[in-house]
């Protein structure tokens, strides 16, 4: 399953609207009945369903964490959507959390980028004014960090 | 390497209660269902149920309704089959088996456990 | 219950030899979907069922070609165009397209 999570089984309730199967498959924003003969829609808000398929229940919405803002709720065919708040963003290498966009640029660095949900800030070396390739850079620790412990490597 | 590997032979008596366990690797375990079979010595084979890991949504044959109970634990990525009120029409090699979620795919038993064998006596 | 039956019960056949099991089903086994839910599993002595077929005549990955089912509504056939030592066993047909799941007794292909 390509999607996030699978959505408790569902017994058709009288408010679940029900079709026949096109070819086998139902249409997005519903799921298959266990015997194969029947599409059951999903459940607004609490499940979905993005193509046609024969999958045996819809799946389950997608809760934005804290730290993320809804950008569009769940509706039976398309999954919630979030982002990450003002100040943090999403790696691609580690997308279940948003992480804290760096206050500054390592010495000799100059900012070319605001952070953005998606995107740390850029930093290019200043004589340069080019990207810097990805690397790892070991910040000397500020004041705020030595008091606090937190000073740390940071790849770019 | 898919892999089910289900829990060792089991002597109980008559009236009592078993578990036994179908422990899966090799593969995502919330991403299929898991059933279970029954085969009596020397006999054919009977499809007790199936249990969707992720949601413990389950679905039963009519015959094994108050007899078998289906449940499982995403963590461990094993599935469980409870027996009650035993007999010894019960005595029989019981099997997990694994199926897909789409329909299509749901009573293809891809991947076998090796066999719980169950012996009810007095 | 969709009853299974399976013709001959024991099999015998000399190994490079043809044979042919036969499944019956009591009702048609054709689903509203079009799709025809018959499947072959074999049990090698000792051990846990396989999967062979899947849908009348698909074979299931790393199953030998000279395996092949056909047939259709109530009648089905698994035919092994050479038989082999490593293919002795009881042969099982099931079908799913109705509830509940049922197999076949099972053939036993056993040497002459």
């Known amino acids: 399953i390509t999607q996030q999570d699978l959505a408790p089984q569902q017994r058709a309730a009288p408010q679940q609207k029900r079709s026949s199967p096109s070819e086998g498959l139902c249409p997005p924003g519903h799921h298959i009945s266990e015997d194969g003969r029947d599409c059951i829609s999903c459940k607004y808000g609490q499940d979905y369903s993005t193509h046609w398929n024969d999958l045996l229940f819809c799946l389950r919405c997608t809760r934005c964490d804290s730290g993320e803002v809804e950008l569009s709720p769940c509706t039976t065919t398309r999954n919630t959507v979030c982002q990450c708040e003002e100040g943090t963003f999403r790696e691609e290498d580690s997308p279940e959390m948003c992480r804290k966009c760096r206050t500054g640029c390592p010495r000799g660095m100059v900012k070319v980028g605001d952070c953005t949900p998606w995107s740390d800030i850029e930093c290019v070396h200043k004589e340069s004014r080019t990207v810097a390739a990805p690397s790892v850079f070991i910040f000397p620790p500020s004041d705020e960090q030595l008091k606090s412990g937190t000073a740390s490597v940071v790849c770019l | 390497e898919v892999q089910l590997q289900q829990s060792g032979p089991e002597l109980v008596k008559p009236g009592a209660s078993v578990k036994m366990s179908c422990k899966a690797s090799?593969?995502?375990?919330?991403?299929?269902?898991m059933h279970w079979v029954k085969q009596k010595p020397g006999q054919g084979l009977e499809w007790i149920g199936y249990?969707?890991?992720?949601?413990?949504?389950?679905k039963y044959n009519e015959k094994f309704k108050g007899k078998a109970t289906l449940t499982s634990d995403k963590s461990s990525s094993t599935a469980y089959m409870e027996l009650s009120r035993l007999t010894s029409e019960d005595s029989a090699v019981y099997y997990c088996?694994?199926?897909?979620?789409?329909?299509?795919?749901?009573?293809?038993?891809?991947?076998w456990g090796q066999g719980t064998t169950l012996t009810v006596s007095s | 219950d969709v009853v299974m039956t399976q013709i001959p019960l024991s099999l015998p056949v000399s190994l490079g030899d043809q044979a042919s099991i036969s499944c019956r089903s009591s009702?048609?086994?054709?689903?509203?979907?079009?799709?025809?839910?018959l499947h072959w599993y074999l049990q090698k002595p000792g051990q846990s069922p396989k999967l062979l077929i899947y849908?009348?005549?698909n074979r299931f990955s790393g199953v030998p070609d000279r395996f092949s089912g056909s047939g259709s509504g109530t009648d089905f056939t698994l035919k092994i165009s050479r038989v082999e030592a490593e293919d002795l066993g009881v042969y099982f047909c099931s079908q799913s397209t109705h509830v509940p799941h049922t197999f076949g007794g099972g053939t036993k292909l056993e040497i002459k």
């Open positions: 088996a694994r199926g897909g979620i789409n329909y299509d795919y749901l009573y293809y038993f891809d991947y």
């Open positions: 849908k009348v005549s």
């Open positions: 009702q048609s086994l054709v689903h509203s979907n079009g799709n025809t839910y």
């Open positions: 249990i969707i890991p992720y949601n413990d949504g389950t």
């Open positions: 090799g593969y995502t375990f919330t991403s299929y269902v």
